[in-house]
């Protein structure tokens, strides 16, 4: 009898190890999306960036969905969201139309159920990029901890998209689930 | 018999609490490394920063290794990586060689198996630090979520290292494991 | 006998699912606090910001306490701390006292047991906000991984508080627990 119970206990431990490992992995959605520079819109006003890579280089996604330029939440939870946006201009990449620039990023959340869009985080700077210098660069980083529900969508808006740095190490955003909602 | 089973159950619960707690702790490597200003290289070109503290003040490390100026991954996983780099100049430190500066940070990953180095994240700004002001300061923050394999190395490169702020609250980088690789 | 053991096993599994879920939730304190702009101090020197929302809009708190302008740790652990601080000025708000500004944030930790305050993270920039431009903006982001003990307090100090952007997506700070202390 005692031997049988020990076998049962081992089975409990074993199945639990599997279950814990499995549930832990399944409980942690994440995404790291990098800019797809082949289709960056022009303009200096705030525009939504819809072209991102999710499966090449550093870009990856798990238990979240990327669709129509938006990162879609599949699992309720508290997530850490972040974005890194780099702007750059070299004299060879076109002449600046103005030296006074507003270089901004807005991380927005859209709820499908109640069609509404809200800015979760913003960052940036006004810059004076004079023609006296042949190269200009500026990066913005924002991050924060937010409650996200399944079906909600995260998107990125920037000003002056024509100045975006197209490198995967420069312009990206992402999210990872930290914990469940109580 | 029933009493015996209950004792076994308690043992299962107890061992599980220990196991879960232990495995959870072991599964979460981290590091927060602060600049060691006694050995900052000079120059304005991009250089790798090799001197960091790992065990004093805010600096700490667990289940990762710091060696030869690089943060070495001991455990496969998805990690959140971050860096905060501060640059500063006071007129008492001497004149700047140029007023047009490129203040940059690059967080790089090196794989030993396939000797190659790749930039995971970059940030910074071009700055005009005019002689009209006696003090100049600028900070960069970058962060992102990356898959790291055991043996891979994380390092920090900056431009204008002679302008680095040597305080532990100013110039640091770190990582913490968020989840296993499926 | 065997049937009884299976029932016990099911009970172990069931209680463990509950226990694991419950302990996981309880083990993860967090806070995301957004600026309360009704009570921002004036001046250009470094001041502690004491008015933050913890329960409206994006602001939230769990298993941590907000009191007297400080975020109080209730549970020992390693936490990721972050802050995003935005400064802005429009010419309609009046002339700036000086065009040379030091826009800074300091994330500090205070220990009650040993009354002392230490800066964990700092960031910012010196800026030249010339009268030639009608609008100026600048954001700072800092983040890092720190060991916090129950009873320790996190607070935010900034320079030039009168220039703070009062939006909840602009000026905020937060923390979330990543792991226990060994």
């Amino acid at each position: 009898g005692s031997q049988h119970i020990r076998a049962e206990k081992a089975m409990v431990d074993g199945s639990w190890l599997d279950l814990a490992k499995r549930s832990k992995l399944e409980a942690q959605p994440f995404a790291h999306l990098t800019i797809n520079a082949t289709d960056i819109p022009s303009g200096s006003h705030k525009v939504s960036l819809s072209s991102w890579y999710h499966d090449r280089g550093w870009a990856k996604i798990s238990n979240m969905t990327f669709s129509n330029g938006k990162l879609i939440v599949n699992q309720d939870g508290f997530y850490y969201l972040y974005a890194n946006i780099c702007f750059r201009h070299h004299e060879t990449s076109g002449d600046l139309a103005t030296e006074y620039l507003q270089l901004m990023v807005y991380v927005t959340k859209t709820s499908i159920k109640i069609p509404s869009s809200h800015t979760l985080m913003k960052g940036g700077s006004t810059k004076y990029w004079s023609g006296n210098s042949e190269f200009h660069f500026y990066s913005i980083n924002v991050g924060g901890f937010f409650k996200l529900r399944s079906g909600e969508e995260i998107s990125i808006e920037v000003s002056n998209p024509s100045l975006l740095d197209p490198d995967q190490d420069a312009t990206y955003f992402g999210a990872f689930k930290v914990r469940d909602i109580d | 018999g029933s009493q015996h089973i209950r004792a076994e159950k308690a043992m299962v619960d107890g061992s599980w609490l220990d196991l879960a707690k232990r495995s959870k702790l072991e599964a979460q490597p981290f590091a927060h490394l602060t600049i060691n200003a006694t050995d900052i290289p000079s120059g304005s070109h991009k250089v790798s920063l090799s001197s960091w503290y790992h065990d004093r003040g805010w600096a700490k490390i667990s289940n990762m290794t710091f060696s030869n100026g690089k943060l070495i991954v001991n455990q496969d996983g998805f990690y959140y990586l971050y860096a905060n780099i501060c640059f500063r100049h006071h007129e008492t430190s001497g004149d700047l060689a140029t007023e047009y500066l490129q203040l940059m940070v690059y967080v790089t990953k090196t794989s030993i198996k396939i000797p190659s180095s790749h930039t995971l994240m970059k940030g910074g700004s071009t700055k005009y630090w005019s002689g009209n002001s006696e003090f100049h300061f600028y900070s960069i923050n970058v962060g992102g979520f990356f898959k790291l394999r055991s043996g891979e190395e994380i390092s920090i490169e900056v431009s204008n290292p002679s302008l680095l702020d040597p305080d532990q609250d100013a110039t640091y980088f770190g990582a913490f494991k968020v989840r296993d690789i499926d | 006998g065997s049937q009884h053991i299976r029932a016990e096993k099911a009970m172990v599994d069931g209680s463990w699912l509950d226990l694991a879920k419950r302990s996981k939730l309880e083990a993860q304190p967090f806070a995301h606090l957004t600026i309360n702009a009704t009570d921002i101090p004036s001046g250009s020197h470094k001041v502690s910001l004491s008015s933050w929302y913890h329960d409206r809009g994006w602001a939230k708190i769990s298993n941590m306490t907000f009191s007297n302008g400080k975020l109080i740790v209730n549970q020992d652990g390693f936490y990721y701390l972050y802050a995003n601080i935005c400064f802005r000025h429009h010419e309609t708000s009046g002339d700036l006292a000086t065009e040379y500004l030091q826009l800074m944030v300091y994330v500090t930790k205070t220990s009650i047991k040993i009354p002392s305050s230490h800066t964990l993270m700092k960031g910012g920039s010196t800026k030249y906000w010339s009268g030639n431009s009608e609008f100026h903006f600048y954001s700072i982001n800092v983040g890092g991984f720190f060991k916090l003990r129950s009873g320790e307090e996190i607070s935010i100090e900034v320079s030039n508080p009168s220039l703070l952007d009062p939006d909840q997506d602009a000026t905020y700070f937060g923390a979330f627990k990543v792991r226990d202390i060994d």
């Epitope: 022009s42 200096s44 990449s93 076109g94 600046l96 139309a97 103005t98 030296e99 023609g131 100045l163 | - | -």
Partner: antibody, heavy 122, light 108 residues
Framework: EVQLLESGGGLVQPGGSLRLSCAAS????????MSWVRQAPGKGLEWVSG????????YYADSVKGRFTISRDNSKNTLYLQMNSLRAEDTAVYYC???????????????WGQGTLVTVSS | EIVLTQSPGTLSLSPGERATLSCRAS???????LAWYQQKPGQAPRLLIY???SRATGIPDRFSGSGSGTDFTLTISRLEPEDFAVFYC?????????FGQGTKVEIK
């Protein structure tokens, strides 16, 4: 309605100078970058020079660098092109053009003035 | 600098026909930053398309632009008598901004 009216063209000898003007109306002149584009008789279009809305930054084609100077007087809503050391190959219709202002880098040209003819000949 | 080559040099078509004009760049045009203009004899050029495919204000929908990278196309779905002119492409993705040599669309 946006209007651009060029003046100052004419016949000039090689090595000589000429100053073109462009009077702008119908928009907030100081908010927009402006350029000069030229077209040699029977030939294609060539961008010559550009200037930011504030006048703080100026840009030139290699073919005119060091010889031409673009400037603007925002109080008079007027764009200028000072042309020195003129050559026969500078003979063209010079158009004053507005940058659309919807991008941070100078972009397409819209609208165009009717142009003024510059002839460099001895 | 980026060299833009337009083809054909001349296109002879009848009203009602479809016109397809090509503009090829010597290197990739950043961000599809390419514009098309129409110029009639004795007149200044007029903007038709910007951003490779966006129609300018007041331009009829028979004019359409497409392409990316190094290959761009202007299509006039059904030629009207007033459409016969010279058409130029222009890139603004790098400095200096450059024009193609033009394609003349003439009545057959």
């Amino acid at each position: 309605e946006v209007q651009l009216l060029e003046s100052g063209g004419g016949l000039v000898q090689p090595g000589g100078s000429l100053r073109l003007s462009c009077a702008a109306s119908g928009f907030t002149f100081s908010s927009y970058a402006m350029s000069w584009v030229r077209q040699a008789p029977g030939k294609g279009l060539e961008w010559v020079s550009g200037i930011t809305g504030s006048g703080g930054s100026t840009y030139y084609a290699d073919s005119v660098k060091g010889r031409f100077t673009i400037s603007r007087d925002n109080s008079k809503n007027t764009l200028y092109l000072q042309m020195n050391s003129l050559r026969a190959e500078d003979t063209a219709v010079y158009y004053c053009v507005k940058d659309p202002g919807t991008t941070s880098i100078m972009s397409w040209f819209d609208p165009w003035g009717q142009g003024t003819l510059v002839t460099v000949s001895s | 600098e980026i060299v833009l080559t337009q083809s054909p040099g001349t296109l002879s078509l009848s009203p009602g026909e479809r016109a397809t004009l090509s503009c090829r760049a010597s290197q990739s045009v950043r961000g599809r930053y390419l514009a098309w203009y129409q110029q009639k004899p004795g007149q200044a050029p007029r903007l038709l398309i910007y951003g490779a495919s966006s129609r300018a204000t007041g331009i009829p929908d028979r004019f359409s632009g497409s392409g990316s990278g190094t290959d761009f196309t202007l299509t006039i779905s059904r030629l009207e008598p007033e459409d016969f002119a010279v058409f130029y492409c222009q890139q603004y993705g790098s400095s200096p901004r450059t024009f193609g040599q033009g394609t003349k669309v003439e009545i057959k």
